[in-house]
C-alpha cells in the first residue's frame, strides 16, 4: 500500500531537489569513469560535490555506493583499501601546527560500518586534501528509470541491465512494486500501479515477469520475480505514476483548454495560488496541454482542493515541473485565489464545438525526448488516470 | 614520535559513567586526527570513536552512538572520551590512537598507539 506523505515532506520545493528528498539514500556520485558504475568517488557537501577521501575508502563503502547507485556490487579490486599508513612529515624543529590550513581544506569521507546505504554516513574534514581519492568499479551496470510519462517520475518502468535498456511486465504489477521503483528514483511514494498500454510500449527486452515487491526493498531488482519471459510482450509493460510527479488540468470551464488550474500531486489535485500565476506560467501550461497559448488570466475563484502550489517560469520552458516551484501544504496561499486560464485553443473563444486542437490521434511533446500519444479529447491530460 | 599515554579506565557499574583522558607529549599535538579503539578479552581491536584535526567533525561506531562523546583539548594537548551509560559489552582495554593524514577510523591511517587503559562494567 502507498506510504503516508511523510511529515517533513509537506512544504518542499524544486530548488530543494540537491538535497535529500524522499527515496534518496545516499548523496554520492561517481565521475570521470568509463560508465556510470565506475569512476571517482563524490559526496555532496551543502551545493558542491567533492572527492571522497581514499585513505579512509573500504570494502564496506565500495559495496554500500555500488548497490545505492544501482551498480550490483563493488568489484574485488575496488575494494583494496590503501596498504600503509600516510606517514607523517619530520617535525621541524619550533615548527607551528599547520592543522587550521589542513583542516580548511579537510577532504569528507563516506564512513560506512557495513555495507548498506543505512549504515553510511558523510564526515566532513576527514582527511587532508592533499591524500588519495577514493575510486570504484562496480560489478554491474544497472540502472531505473521512467519513460513516456511526462517526467521523470510517472512513466513506463524500465531496467538496464547488461547494456540494454528493458521493460518488466505486468503480471502481479501492484502497489508495492511501484512503490519500490518510486523511492528507488527518489519520487516518493507510489500513487498508480499501471498496467500495460497505459504508456506508450517499451521495444527492447522484458527484463523481468513475476514481479513481487514486499514494498520495503531498496531496489527493484531485490524484489523477487521472474526473468522475462517469451510469452510476455510490450502490451503488458508495467507502469507507475509516484508521488512527486506532476500532472495539470483546467477544470470548470468550457472545455479542456479553460478553467481553473489544477495540479495532481503527492495523491490529490490541489489548486495553484493566482498570487504568483502570471502570464510566462499561463503560456507554459497551455502549450504543455496542447492548448496553444494564454489568451487570459480570468479572476480566480476561493481554493476548494487541497494544496497550494506556486509556480514562477521564464516562459520557456515545457512544463511547469520544469519551473520553480513551491509546495505548501500547511497554510492558505495569503490573499489568493485560485488560479485560471483561458488558453487559445478553447472553444469559448472560437465559438467552435471542438477545440482548435484536432480531436484525433495527436503528440504532444512534453520533454526535450519523451512524448506522449493521446487518443482522443476526452483523455488528453498529460497523466492519463 | 608522539607518545600517547591514557588515563581514566577503571571498574564501573552497568549505567555508569567514566571520562578517559590521553595525554600526548607532541607539540603539534594538533596536527593530528585522533580517536579511539578498544580491545575486549579474547576479541579484535575495534574502532570507537574519532575526531578531526580542530574537533569540528567526529564519528562514532554505531555501538556508542548516543551514550559516548570524543571530545579535544588543543591548548592541554588532550583527548577525552566521555563514556555514558556503560554496558558489560564496554568492558576492554581502551587505545588513544593519532593519525596525520585522516580521521583514524580504519587501522591502518593509524600512526600511534597508546598503550591502553583498562575500563570494567561489572556489577
Known amino acids: 500500500h502507498p506510504s503516508p506523505a511523510p511529515p517533513d515532506q509537506l512544504n518542499t520545493s524544486s530548488a530543494e531537489s540537491e538535497l535529500w528528498e524522499p527515496g534518496e539514500r545516499l548523496p554520492v556520485r561517481l565521475t570521470n569513469g568509463s560508465s556510470s558504475c565506475s569512476g571517482t568517488v563524490e559526496v555532496r557537501l551543502e551545493a558542491s560535490w567533492e572527492p571522497a577521501c581514499g585513505a579512509l575508502w573500504d570494502s564496506r563503502a565500495a559495496e554500500a555506493v555500488c548497490r545505492a547507485l544501482g551498480c550490483g556490487g563493488a568489484e574485488a579490486a575496488s575494494q583494496l583499501a590503501p596498504p600503509t599508513p600516510e606517514l607523517p612529515p619530520p617535525p621541524a624543529a619550533g615548527n607551528t601546527s599547520v592543522a587550521a590550513n589542513a583542516t580548511l581544506a579537510g577532504a569528507p569521507a563516506l564512513l560506512c560500518s557495513g555495507a548498506e546505504w543505512r549504515l553510511c554516513e558523510v564526515v566532513e574534514h576527514a582527511c587532508r586534501s592533499d591524500g588519495r581519492r577514493a575510486r570504484v568499479t562496480c560489478a554491474e551496470n544497472r540502472a531505473l528509470r521512467l519513460v513516456d510519462g511526462g517526467g521523470a517520475c510517472a512513466g513506463r518502468v524500465e531496467m538496464l541491465e547488461h547494456g540494454e535498456w528493458g521493460s518488466v511486465c505486468d503480471d502481479t504489477w501492484d502497489l508495492e512494486d511501484a512503490h519500490v521503483v518510486c523511492r528507488q528514483l527518489g519520487c516518493g511514494w507510489a500513487v498508480q500501479a499501471l498496467p500495460g498500454l497505459h504508456f506508450t510500449p517499451g521495444r527492447g527486452p522484458i527484463h523481468r515477469d513475476q514481479v513481487n515487491c514486499s514494498g520495503a526493498e531498496a531496489y527493484l531488482w531485490d524484489c523477487p520475480g521472474l526473468p522475462g519471459q517469451h510469452y510476455c510482450g510490450h502490451k503488458e509493460d508495467a507502469g507507475a505514476v509516484c508521488s512527486e510527479h506532476q500532472s495539470w488540468r483546467l477544470t470548470g470551464g468550457a472545455d479542456r483548454c479553460e478553467g481553473q488550474v489544477e495540479v495532481h500531486f503527492r495523491g490529490v489535485w490541489n489548486t495553484v495560488c493566482d498570487s504568483e500565476w502570471y502570464p510566462s506560467e499561463a503560456k507554459v501550461l497551455c502549450q504543455s496541454l496542447g492548448c496553444g497559448t494564454a489568451v487570459e488570466r480570468p479572476k480566480g475563484l476561493p481554493h476548494s482542493l487541497s494544496g497550494r502550489m506556486y509556480y514562477s517560469c521564464n516562459g520557456e520552458e515545457l512544463t511547469l515541473s520544469n519551473c520553480s516551484w513551491r509546495f505548501n501544504n500547511s497554510n492558505l496561499c495569503s490573499q489568493s485565489l485560485a488560479a485560471r486560464v483561458l488558453c487559445s485553443a478553447s472553444r469559448s473563444l472560437h465559438n467552435l464545438s471542438t477545440p482548435e486542437v484536432p480531436a484525433s490521434v495527436q503528440t504532444v511533446t512534453i520533454e526535450s525526448s519523451v512524448t506522449v500519444k493521446i487518443e482522443n479529447k476526452e483523455s488528453r491530460e498529460l497523466m492519463l488516470l | 614520535q608522539v607518545q600517547l599515554v591514557e588515563s581514566g579506565g577503571g571498574l564501573v557499574q552497568p549505567g555508569g559513567s567514566l571520562r578517559l583522558s590521553c595525554s600526548a607529549s607532541e607539540r603539534t599535538f594538533s596536527d593530528y586526527a585522533l580517536g579511539w579503539f578498544r580491545q575486549a578479552p579474547g576479541k579484535e581491536r575495534e574502532f570507537v570513536a574519532a575526531?578531526?584535526?580542530?574537533?569540528?567533525?567526529?564519528y562514532y561506531a554505531d555501538s556508542v552512538k548516543g551514550r559516548f562523546t570524543i571530545s579535544r583539548d588543543n591548548s592541554k594537548n588532550t583527548l577525552y572520551l566521555q563514556m555514558n551509560s556503560l554496558r558489560a559489552e564496554d568492558t576492554a582495554v581502551y587505545f588513544c590512537?593519532?593519525?596525520?593524514?585522516?580521521?583514524?577510523?580504519?587501522?591502518?591511517?593509524?600512526?600511534?598507539w597508546g598503550k591502553g587503559t583498562l575500563v570494567t562494567v561489572s556489577s
Open positions: 590512537v593519532a593519525s596525520w593524514g585522516a580521521m583514524p577510523v580504519l587501522t591502518h591511517v593509524i600512526n600511534y
Open positions: 575526531i578531526n584535526w580542530v574537533g569540528g567533525s567526529t
